[in-house]
Interface confidence: low
């Protein structure tokens, strides 16, 4: 295509010979600026046509000769006004003007649609001097026209600060239809209407559109471009394209696939990323989305224990990030887990179920009914309790941890004891007399130490007291009891 610029063109000298009125009287060009590419254009339009000079934009010279005879007005001669040709053909057109020899130099420039065209590879200026005038022919050629070369071309010449403008030469490049809008692939709901758009331009106009669905024409009569095809609905995938026709022939658009949205395929590769006593972190690979974005996923969890009631827990989450931490599970339990995801059409089937187990955890409750009493005869404190409920042990019980704190005037001493899992009683030696002993007990599994029971306090008197009754875990609301027997 033609390069456009806004720079000044360098003027060609009007008389490249030694002096005006050179001996060269024939009509061979005195100076010819050759076409760089050296080809012979396919179309050539003659420089001049017989008839009156163009009078649209003329310059009337102020200079007079010796006889004071006024010079004629200057104007470009008429030339061809409209050139129609096919894409990729060559074209050459020109404008000509006769200029009195009194003008020492001048410039002819070519303009397209209001912008100056630069590039010597397009333009040749030839000079034919005579006694009084020099004929100037400016030719413009394009080797292989494109649609972008369409437009209005003019010559301009500056003389005496006057601008002379030629009649326009309209170039119309014709070719096969050119798409400005093609149908786009879409994902649509089954049996729901949708539109496809196709637009193509010439020249030549008009451009007519035929629609094609799965290789068969949809419309018997063509529609003028642009065309909107309303498809009332599809039940299965289809490929659409459009044909654009003009006098030069036919262009076919790309074929676009229209997919029918469906429920997604079930997720695959559900896997366990991490297990704790009360949670399982799972991930999955989403199945095919059914041509509609995933919105949510549902994680279904059921106890794998054959004695369980078979109820299913459901956890909903967003489709991203294909990762979910299932919480509030029991420790040391087996679960079956499945995942299903949804798009706007509906839910997928559930993925293949996988088995997962929670690990052992620390017990979630403390031992119950803690009772403490003093056995003076052996100078021991006896402690009794009840096991936490099996369900809340969160693992296999390996023992108990007993904290006993001894406090008397100015002294505080805490000791920890570990006892085996079989018993539900322990005996500890009195550490300090005339002191308060505070006892708390926690259950222990391989998963860790559970919470400690509420403190139970007993006063250990000085030697010589007679009888001792037990202290127990206080009833709710009785804070911090100290039983002195």
């Amino acid at each position: 295509a033609i390069t456009e610029a806004r720079e000044e063109a360098k003027p060609y000298p009007l008389f490249p010979g030694p002096f005006p009125g050179s001996l060269q009287t024939d009509h061979t060009p005195l100076l010819s600026l050759p076409h760089a590419s050296g080809y012979q254009p396919a179309l050539m339009f003659s420089p001049t046509q017989p008839g009156r000079p163009h009078t649209g934009n003329v310059a009337i010279p102020q200079v007079t000769s010796v006889e004071s005879k006024p010079l004629p007005p200057l104007a470009f001669k008429h030339t061809v006004g409209h050139i129609i040709l096919s894409e990729h053909k060559g074209v050459k057109f020109n404008c000509s003007i006769s200029v009195p020899n009194i003008y020492q130099d001048t410039t002819i420039s070519w303009w397209k649609d209001g912008k100056e065209l630069l590039g010597a590879h397009h333009a040749i200026t030839q000079f034919y001097p005579d006694d009084e005038v020099t004929a100037i022919i400016a030719s413009f050629s394009i080797t292989s026209v494109q649609r972008s070369d369409n437009g209005s071309y003019i010559c301009k010449m500056k003389i005496n600060n006057e601008e002379i403008v030629s009649d326009p030469i309209y170039i119309e490049v014709q070719g096969l239809p050119h798409f400005t809008k093609q149908p786009e692939s879409m994902n649509v709901t089954r049996n729901t209407a949708f539109n496809l758009t196709c637009q193509a331009v010439g020249p030549p106009e008009p451009v007519n559109i035929f629609w094609v669905q799965n290789s068969s024409r949809v419309n018997e009569q063509p529609e003028k471009s642009p065309s909107v095809l309303t498809v009332p609905g599809l039940t299965e995938m289809a490929v659409f394209s459009c044909e654009a026709h003009n006098d030069k022939g036919l262009t076919v658009s790309k074929g676009v696939q229209i997919n029918i949205k469906a429920i997604p395929s079930p997720p695959t590769e559900v896997s366990i990323r991490n297990s704790t006593a009360h949670s399982i972190l799972i991930s999955w690979v989403p199945g095919f989305d059914g041509y509609s974005p995933f919105r949510n996923c549902s994680i279904q969890v059921k106890e794998a224990d054959p004695l369980s009631n078979g109820s299913v827990m459901i956890f909903n989450t967003s489709a991203l990030p294909h990762l979910y931490q299932i919480k509030q599970l029991q420790a040391l339990a087996n679960y079956s887990i499945g995942v299903s995801c949804m798009n706007e059409i509906g839910w997928s089937a559930v993925s293949p179920w996988i088995l997962a187990s929670t690990t052992e955890g620390a017990p979630s409750v403390a031992p119950l009914n803690v009772t403490v009493f003093l056995n003076e005869s052996s100078d021991n404190v006896d402690i009794r309790w009840m096991k936490p409920p099996t369900k809340q042990q969160d693992g296999e019980l390996v023992g108990y941890r007993i904290s006993h704190v001894w406090q008397s005037a100015g002294i505080s001493k805490e000791l920890l004891e570990e006892v085996g899992q079989n018993g539900s009683r322990a005996r500890i030696s009195v550490q300090v007399h005339n002191a308060t002993c505070t006892v708390r007990i926690a259950a222990v599994t391989r998963g860790g130490v559970g919470p400690f029971s509420d403190p139970v306090k007993i006063f250990i008197p000085a030697h010589g007291w007679v009888d001792y009754a037990p202290s127990s875990t206080p009833a709710p609301g009785n804070a911090d009891p100290v039983l002195i027997i």
């Epitope: 879409m186 974005p293 919105r295 294909h322």
Partner: antibody, heavy 120, light 108 residues
Framework: QVQLQQSGPELVKPGASVKLSCKAS????????INWVKQRPGQGLEWIGW????????KYKEKFKGKATLTVDTSSSTAYMELHSLTSEDSAVYFC?????????????WGQGTTLTVSS | EIVLTQSPTTMATSPGEKITITCSAS???????LHWYQQKPGFSPKLLIY???NLASGVPDRFSGSGSGTSYSLTIGTMEAEDVATYYC?????????FGAGTKLELK
């Protein structure tokens, strides 16, 4: 071709609210999420949240819950983000971006950004 | 949230150099979820590479990406002046979606 055209720059006072817009063209608006991303001057990119135009489903980064409200008008293929109780910390360029949802979330087209200046 | 750490923060380069930017994730992500963006001064970010190694439309093949697990990298085979920009990695694995802090490439 796909384009996201965002509204012009905003100068607002602290404590006020502002509503930014993002007009989509060149694709089916209801088929892709619109995300919003914040960029403080000279800083990196921070995801605010997304909205799915078909059903208005939203997802926010925790820190923007209550600060940003995402909405859409499907009839004009326009997404909006309203920012509330503005402070100087909210001065930033806000981008809208189309989320390519193929189980591996990325942003394939971006708006040109809206500059928000919060100043008294 | 997954934190993405980019290095270096800034880099002065010359045309023709080979450039490598790294992005480290705080936890392992599949390579499907790591993407790269280019942001030139005064412009919005542009998708450069998606799914670790796939070039987005119109991106010159001097750009490439690789990595797995927690470690990813973006390479410019031969630096050109037009590549001066800030580059961000982004993960799509976990909500919130997060970006690296960016690597700024400058010319010496």
């Amino acid at each position: 071709q796909v384009q996201l055209q965002q509204s012009g720059p905003e100068l607002v006072k602290p404590g006020a609210s502002v509503k930014l817009s993002c007009k989509a063209s060149g694709y089916t608006f209801t088929s892709y999420d619109i995300n919003w991303v914040k960029q403080r001057p000279g800083q990196g990119l921070e995801w605010i949240g997304w909205i799915y135009p078909r059903d208005g489903y939203t997802k926010y980064k925790e820190k923007f819950k209550g600060k940003a409200t995402l909405t859409v008008d499907t009839s004009s293929s326009t997404a909006y983000m309203e920012l509330h109780s503005l402070t100087s910390e909210d001065s930033a360029v806000y981008f809208c971006a189309r989320g390519f949802y193929s189980n591996l979330y990325y942003f394939d087209y971006w708006g040109q950004g809206t500059t928000l200046t919060v100043s008294s | 949230e997954i934190v993405l750490t980019q290095s270096p923060t800034t880099m002065a380069t010359s045309p023709g150099e080979k450039i490598t930017i790294t992005c480290s994730a705080s936890s392992s992500i599949s390579s499907n979820y790591l993407h790269w963006y280019q942001q030139k001064p005064g412009f919005s970010p542009k998708l450069l590479i998606y799914r670790t190694s796939n070039l987005a439309s119109g991106v010159p093949d001097r750009f490439s990406g690789s990595g797995s697990g927690t470690s990813y990298s973006l390479t410019i085979g031969t630096m050109e002046a037009e590549d001066v920009a800030t580059y961000y990695c982004q993960q799509g694995r976990s909500i919130p979606l997060t970006f690296g802090a960016g690597t700024k490439l400058e010319l010496k």
